[in-house]
């Protein structure tokens, strides 16, 4: 007789999910020499020990301090890009300028990266069928918990100016819902960074507003201010222009705005 | 089938550098992923790390003894070179070479012979 | 630097008997530890790694356990070719370090 299974409204764990996070792993340290340390295996374990038996609908932060632990990497607190409902253009952008980080440059974001997981309560397997939605079923799923977790760190590693890259072709340009909204901004450290720039892109070709005055950007002004953080705001009304002079600064057409 | 056989000096006087060299076998450090180490053992004593070079020459040295220690490779001569300079009596030890690789981290999976080095005037 | 106090420093059992060796890491390295058996004039041969994998080859007899600073390295039911010095390792954190090692004799 099957037994039965908690039939959640999420897509269940991503298929090959263990050696994905292992891969992943390997190559990671193999492309940043400053976390060959690492132990992959342990690091599997630590991942697969922060959700497995454990009730998708209870997981804590505490459940993956042995992985953070793990993943403990030291960026410059400077260079840091958070991003909000933008991730493919910040990624972009990171991959050219290679001296500014996302989430997902370090360890521990690269790792579940569009990845989906959770388990069972009192079993040790992976479920494979459904996982929690954040909205339908429960807020402390594994995958929300670990984005919470990373993403608190990350922006309570922040100092001086930290930019964030955020969509303008969205109906909330600011969202206090987002992860960025709703953990990062409220841990960024006032002791620490100087300035939160946010970087607006714009989506049409013919869109030349200054979407630095849309009422979202000037709640978030308004939060970031209260928390005695400077803000600016800087339209980028050609994103794929403003990549191509990411790569090529030198080029004439790039002292104009973008 | 990975095999690694140190070679040097079997006895060296005090003050003077020591070089040995780990060639090695069914191991390529123009391979990604893969790298080379040494660990000593002074008689009846633990063992210690001393260093580790991965492929594209990311270099780890043991902070106690950096300053005296050099590792180098020759990828096209399958060899793995390590230099210690100001050699003692206390450094009297077999030395081992040994490969590494990605994803392990620092877990020495196949071991040479080992070299027993004689520090003595 | 992490310190791996390994206990005991030497013992004796009989073939069949189950032995146990343990080693205490000085800061918590997670799960990053190797055990390595050395017979005399040989070079150690890796047993165990990341606390509780078996290496290739290892026979099931070995086994590896722990967390955090302790750990456990079990022979199940001893072999004479099991006489060996046994070492724990810690590969969390450069410098790698190892324990002072285990002698195990044959009663």
């Known amino acids: 007789v099957p037994r039965w299974r908690q039939q959640w409204s999420g897509p269940g764990t991503t298929k090959r999910f263990p050696e994905t996070v292992l891969a992943r792993c390997v190559k990671y340290t193999e492309i940043h020499p400053e976390m060959r340390h690492v132990d992959c295996q342990s690091v599997w374990d630590a991942f697969k020990g922060a959700f497995i038996s454990k009730h998708p609908c209870n997981i804590t932060e505490e459940d993956y301090q042995p992985l953070m632990k793990l993943g403990t990497q030291t960026v410059p607190c400077n260079k840091i890009l958070l991003w909000s409902r933008i991730k493919d253009l910040a990624h972009q952008f990171t991959q050219v300028q290679r001296d500014m980080f996302t989430l997902e440059d370090t360890l521990l974001g690269y790792l579940a990266d569009d990845l989906t997981w959770c388990g069972e309560f009192n079993t040790s397997k992976i479920n494979y069928q459904s996982c929690p939605d954040w909205r339908k079923d429960c807020s402390n799923n594994p995958v929300s918990v670990f984005w919470k977790t990373v993403s608190r760190r990350f922006a309570e590693a922040a100092c001086d100016v930290v930019h964030v890259m955020l969509n303008g072709s969205r109906s909330k340009i600011f969202d206090k819902n987002s992860t960025f909204g709703s953990v990062e901004v409220h841990n960024l450290q006032p002791e620490k960074v100087q300035t939160l720039e946010a970087w607006v892109i714009h989506g049409g070709r013919e869109d030349s507003r200054d979407l630095c005055q849309d009422p979202t950007i000037k709640e978030l002004e308004s939060i970031i201010s209260k928390r005695n953080i400077q803000f600016s705001c800087k339209n980028i009304y050609r994103p794929d222009k403003f990549l191509q002079c990411v790569k090529n600064p030198e080029d004439s057409s790039c002292t104009s705005e973008i | 089938q990975v095999t690694l056989k140190e070679s040097g000096p079997t006895l060296v006087k005090p003050t003077q550098t020591l070089t040995l060299t780990c060639t090695f076998s069914?191991?390529?450090?123009?391979?990604?992923?893969?790298?080379v180490g040494w660990i000593r053992q002074p008689p009846g004593k633990a063992l210690e790390w001393l260093a580790h070079?991965?492929?594209?020459?990311?270099?780890r040295y043991n902070p106690a003894l950096k300053s005296r220690l050099t590792i180098t490779k020759d990828t096209s001569k399958n060899q793995v070179v390590l230099t210690m300079t100001n050699m003692d009596p206390v450094d009297t030890a077999t030395y081992y070479c040994?490969?590494?690789?990605?994803?392990?981290?620092?877990?020495?999976?196949?071991w040479g012979q080992g070299t027993l080095v004689t520090v003595s005037s | 630097d992490i310190q791996m106090t390994q206990s005991p420093s030497s013992l004796s059992a009989s073939v069949g008997d189950r032995v146990t060796i343990t080693c205490q890491a000085s800061?918590?390295?997670?799960?990053?530890v190797a055990w390595y058996q050395q017979k005399p004039g040989k070079a150690p041969k890796l047993l165990i790694y990341?606390?509780?994998y078996r290496y290739t080859g290892v026979p099931s007899r070995f086994s590896g356990s722990g967390s955090g600073t302790d750990f456990t390295f079990t022979i199940s039911s001893l072999q004479p070719e099991d006489i060996a010095t046994y070492y724990c390792?810690?590969?969390?954190?450069?410098?790698?370090?190892f324990g002072q090692g285990t002698k195990l004799e044959i009663k």
């Open positions: 040994a490969r590494i690789e990605l994803g392990r981290s620092y877990v020495m999976d196949y």
């Open positions: 800061q918590d390295v997670i799960t990053s």
């Open positions: 990341s606390a509780s």
């Open positions: 390792q810690q590969h969390y954190t450069i410098p790698l370090t």
């Open positions: 069914g191991l390529s450090l123009s391979t990604s992923g893969k790298g």
């Open positions: 070079i991965w492929w594209d020459d990311d270099k």
